[in-house]
Interface confidence: low
């Protein structure tokens, strides 16, 4: 009896959904694999006979419910097959948005980049498949633990009247209001205001 | 340290109007989001309304429930955020709270709580 693949699991961010598993133990030999998702009340192959304990799902459609299977393979052996559902738009992970910090004196002018999605057009991003989509912008001085927090109304955001020659760090995320859901927070970028630019009588 | 005091509860009747005031101290940016959630009793805790002053103008989010009849508002020189509340229903009756960081409407994430304002629709 080949036993079934073990921890299978979804991992999707920005859309590119990888199925993943691990290899069970197995006395006899190395193990193949074969994926396949449900396409009009039938099963299709995506990924046949394969070693690896991956397949890229990334073609199907973002909307709606898939239902995904995989099993474990030896000779002509196979395990019962394991099934997970997955909905792109409702389960994938909204990865760190890009951003685009410059300084100009006491202000910080900040751009964001929606995260593009994969096989799509080179302009596609998660902003087009979400239409709520907005930013979460927070902010603090270096070396300080309190935070402040704002929902920008655009791509781009200026922060004003800051302490001249301090060190302020900010990082952004895509934020979902209608779904109250978050995606991942950037890595914080951190750039030091000059002088105001106020000029001494 | 931040702290949050609300005042402008009280009794009204189904259909009347309220306008809750949160004074803030202890604020060192105006970026800060701030709103107020409420807790009916038996209930837990839920965001009503949130703003986010930024370089440009302000957002503000609503939940559903109080779309169109609450108005969230904020005065920055007086370090003030209001919640004006218009065509009020029994089930809005709840202890009011402020809060600063309101990401997420529908879970009461915030890291500074006010002691709250109690707010009672009934005829």
């Known amino acids: 009896m080949v036993p079934p693949p073990e921890n299978v699991r979804m991992n999707s961010v920005n859309f590119k959904n990888i199925l993943q598993w691990e290899s069970p133990a197995f006395a006899k030999g190395n193990l193949t694999f074969t994926a396949q998702y449900l396409s009009y009340r039938i099963f299709q192959d995506k990924c046949m006979n394969t070693t690896l304990t991956e397949c890229d799902f990334s073609s199907l459609s973002k909307y709606g419910d898939h239902t995904l299977r995989v099993r474990a393979e030896f000779a002509d052996e196979h395990s019962d097959w394991v099934n997970i559902t997955f909905c792109p738009v409702d389960d994938t992970i909204i990865g760190p948005p890009g951003m685009q910090v410059e300084v100009l004196a006491d202000s910080l002018h900040m751009r964001f980049l929606a995260p593009k999605i994969e096989n799509e057009y080179e302009t596609w991003t998660m902003k087009n498949v979400y239409n709520s989509w907005t930013y979460n912008v927070q902010y603090w001085k270096n070396g300080t633990d309190e935070k402040f927090q704002i929902t920008p109304q655009y791509d781009f955001e200026v922060l004003r009247n800051l302490e001249p020659w301090t060190t302020y760090c900010v990082q952004v995320r895509g934020f979902l209001p209608d779904r109250n859901k978050a995606g991942e927070w950037s890595e914080p970028v951190c750039e030091q205001t000059t002088h105001d630019e106020t000029v001494p009588s | 340290e931040v702290q949050l005091v609300e005042s402008g509860g009280g009794l009204v009747q189904p259909g009347g109007s309220l306008r809750l005031s949160c004074s803030a101290s202890?604020?060192?940016?105006?970026?800060?989001?701030i709103g107020w959630f409420r807790q009916a009793p038996g209930k837990g805790r839920e965001g009503v309304a949130c703003?986010?002053?930024?370089?440009?103008?302000?957002?503000?989010n609503y939940i559903d429930s109080v779309r169109g009849r609450f108005t969230i508002s904020r005065d920055n020189s007086k370090n003030t955020v209001y919640l004006q509340m218009n065509s009020l229903r029994a089930e809005d009756t709840a202890v009011y709270y402020c809060?600063?960081?309101?990401?997420?409407?529908?879970?009461?994430?915030?890291?500074?709580w006010g002691q709250g304002t109690m707010v009672t629709v009934s005829s």
């Open positions: 703003i986010s002053s930024s370089g440009r103008g302000v957002n503000a």
């Open positions: 202890g604020f060192t940016s105006p970026y800060s989001t």
């Open positions: 809060a600063t960081n309101c990401w997420r409407l529908t879970s009461p994430a915030a890291d500074n």
